[in-house]
Interface confidence: low
Amino acid sequence: QRKRRNTIHEFKKSAKTTLIKIDPALKIKTKKVNTADQCANRCTRNKGLPFTCKAFVFDKARKQCLWFPFNSMSSGVKKEFGHEFDLYENKDYIRNCIIGKGRSYKGTVSITKSGIKCQPWSSMIPHEHSFLPSSYRGKDLQENYCRNPRGEEGGPWCFTSNPEVRYEVCDIPQCSEVECMTCNGESYRGLMDHTESGKICQRWDHQTPHRHKFLPERYPDKGFDDNYCRNPDGQPRPWCYTLDPHTRWEYCAIKTCADNTMNDTDVPLETTECIQGQGEGYRGTVNTIWNGIPCQRWDSQYPHEHDMTPENFKCKDLRENYCRNPDGSESPWCFTTDPNIRVGYCSQIPNCDMSHGQDCYRGNGKNYMGNLSQTRSGLTCSMWDKNMEDLHRHIFWEPDASKLNENYCRNPDDDAHGPWCYTGNPLIPWDYCPISRCEGDTTPTIVNLDHPVISCAKTKQLRVVNGIPTRTNIGWMVSLRYRNKHICGGSLIKESWVLTARQCFPSRDLKDYEAWLGIHDVHGRGDEKCKQVLNVSQLVYGPEGSDLVLMKLARPAVLDDFVSTIDLPNYGCTIPEKTSCSVYGWGYTGLINYDGLLRVAHLYIMGNEKCSQHHRGKVTLNESEICAGAEKIGSGPCEGDYGGPLVCEQHKMRMVLGVIVPGRGCAIPNRPGIFVRVAYYAKWIHKIILTYKVPQS
């Protein structure tokens, strides 16, 4: 017995939709059936229908077919929403292009190539002919529409209304000419429904002849409509399963759009200096991962073999060895040139702020009167008059209300780091605005510093090398874990807050991180009784350029014999030169059989000017940096201790005076380390602790 072909692939489905006829003269036919496939077969063959079937509705609740001689484009008809209905329209009647010779074309073009109006098929004026609708049943010789009932070369044609021109072909394009895609067609949502060899595509919502997992309801964003070619899985171009039982799938012949433009919805905003969203549009030239390891070229297979080549990922700008996000990862990344580290994120690229033209402030911006009203993370500022109670809570004088108009960025509390505003977002009560200090403005924001000159040096990841194992009074030391591995140090400065470095967060997903407290061994061995493991609930990034992060814990740490907080210095304080200090960390220690124990290295404070000299004058320190040199040659911070503290004692009080960030080399003799100067940011830290809500224990 010959297997009857399944014709539902010839229909365009509109879920939860039905057609209502406004014109009562329009006919309709109904019948109880089990499946939409049965409706389709009958519609295609016009079996037992008193009209040419152009569409049908399947009523899922009543298991009923409603066949129509019209479709949604016909006059006297309107579309209506209905949960139980699915509308199927024969693609031949709504397609405005032809496949092959256009034998199946049933569209409504009725003008010839040279612009002459077509003669109706049922008329013999001005040209007599034998192409009567009754003689060519199923060929839809309706009205005066262009048709190709015999499948002749040249495509659809018609007799013309011009007595001088008997017939002429119509200018209906090939579907393969109309359809075009950008890049590899991942965003293609066109109507191509056959493969490059001409095979008809299988519907995505069908499992015959080929079973597959690309179910429309499982992938609602992949555009699995009807049986159109799609690229859901990052292939070189769109493809589909075919109706040929012997050919599971095949690519479709869809040309690349001439100007290669994408819809606005598909194009990630291109940036070169910063990351917007997940950085899929980042087109800058950063070419190292977060810890300074250089990237491998995208067109190279050494040291890592991969498929992320410029040929496979067109439009993703996989040039040179620049950080990119071709695959929808959480941020730009690259393969690295280190054979032991396959990939890394380039999380040192800053998030785009909302920089607004030439707006700038002088000093600390307390006199700034511009009208920017957006934070650096893009949040809209809330009105000052709604936040006065909060403002009074952390300043001890009456703010100048005349300056606090509308929701403009201002600096009513003399913040050292520039204008800010309240946001109305309970998670981020306030934040700084993306305004820079005016060029050439050298007003120091705090006094008693050598030279407030910005430094630009940066180097590799840091670890404590050749330190002495330590156990006493280090309860404030935090091991920040990234995907269960130690990545950075940190200091517990309050039960719910850890001070650490911005470079410690390669991923934006907070679920990737946890804080281990009360440990001495980096793996927690032997620390089970004293260890506290806490999730991270928020990251508060420090003022622009600070490299600091305040990490909020999901619940407060319990202070005990093993876990304690460390004090912060007073804002703007200076500590005498030669003061003895220490850095702490679990990073690689220079020993072959590294035991994983927390190390300490002893350093002494050095003035910024002297420090600059030790760096052969190549480094000029600014007011936000502090310098400390090793007492022991080759001892100091090195790779892996970012975020950890520089701890100093003054008047019998131990404080965190510096934070280790990617700095100026690793334990090099006569090269002191440069740290973020916590005293410069102390007011910011206090302000965050005071204004950000934390969970109660």
Epitope: H210, R211, K213, G234, H306
Partner: antibody, heavy 118, light 112 residues
Framework: SVEESGGRLVPPGTPLTLTCTVS????????MGWVRQAPGKGLEYIGM?????STYYADWAKGRLTISKTPTTVDLEITSPTTEDTATYFC????????????????WGQGTLVTVSS | QVLTQTPSPVSAAVGGTVTINCQAS????????FSWYQQKPGQPPKLLIY???TLASGVPSRFKGSGSGTQFTLTISGVQCGDAATYYC?????????????FGGGTEVVVK
Amino acid sequence: SVEESGGRLVPPGTPLTLTCTVSGIDLSSYAMGWVRQAPGKGLEYIGMIDVSGSTYYADWAKGRLTISKTPTTVDLEITSPTTEDTATYFCARLIDERSTYSYAFDLWGQGTLVTVSS
Amino acid sequence: QVLTQTPSPVSAAVGGTVTINCQASQSFYNNGAFSWYQQKPGQPPKLLIYDASTLASGVPSRFKGSGSGTQFTLTISGVQCGDAATYYCQGEFSCGSADCVAFGGGTEVVVK
């Protein structure tokens, strides 16, 4: 190849992340799954992450375990382990989506043992 | 969805035939999204059969999968010593908008 790591002894309630490192497998072309096996017991499906990064979990695993991925690793986070979570955890590749309908796991790692005990 | 494997354990002589059944508590949608695995002690499972009857790459033709609906069968003919292992069936079923996967409890095959 597929290799799991991160298994160790943890006290109950201590979050744990297992990492599955793949080589020679393009995670933008293959879905990956996690399956576990308690000592002396049978296989238990945990969940999968598909090529687009969407995750699917067994009913019992929803909210208890989280699967995520980077370009070369697939992670399984056990948010609050209990003693019932003691098992060998296998990471496995799902057979090419376009060559079969089945969720067949055609390439497995050796597994990593997680012991949850106080 | 529960997959019940019978019998367990099952013993066979070298050269003999072993049949393992797997009964599903509900029919698998798309009837045949079904796999069989072999696992030896201390090793990960190895895929033998997928799509109910398709032999995985490198698996000898002595292994044969069959069945549909709720009843599936793995037949090992010409049993060899190396076939001693635990065999698991695996199927998937619809749950919400996703697919869920279930394994059978395993059948131990002892070769005499």
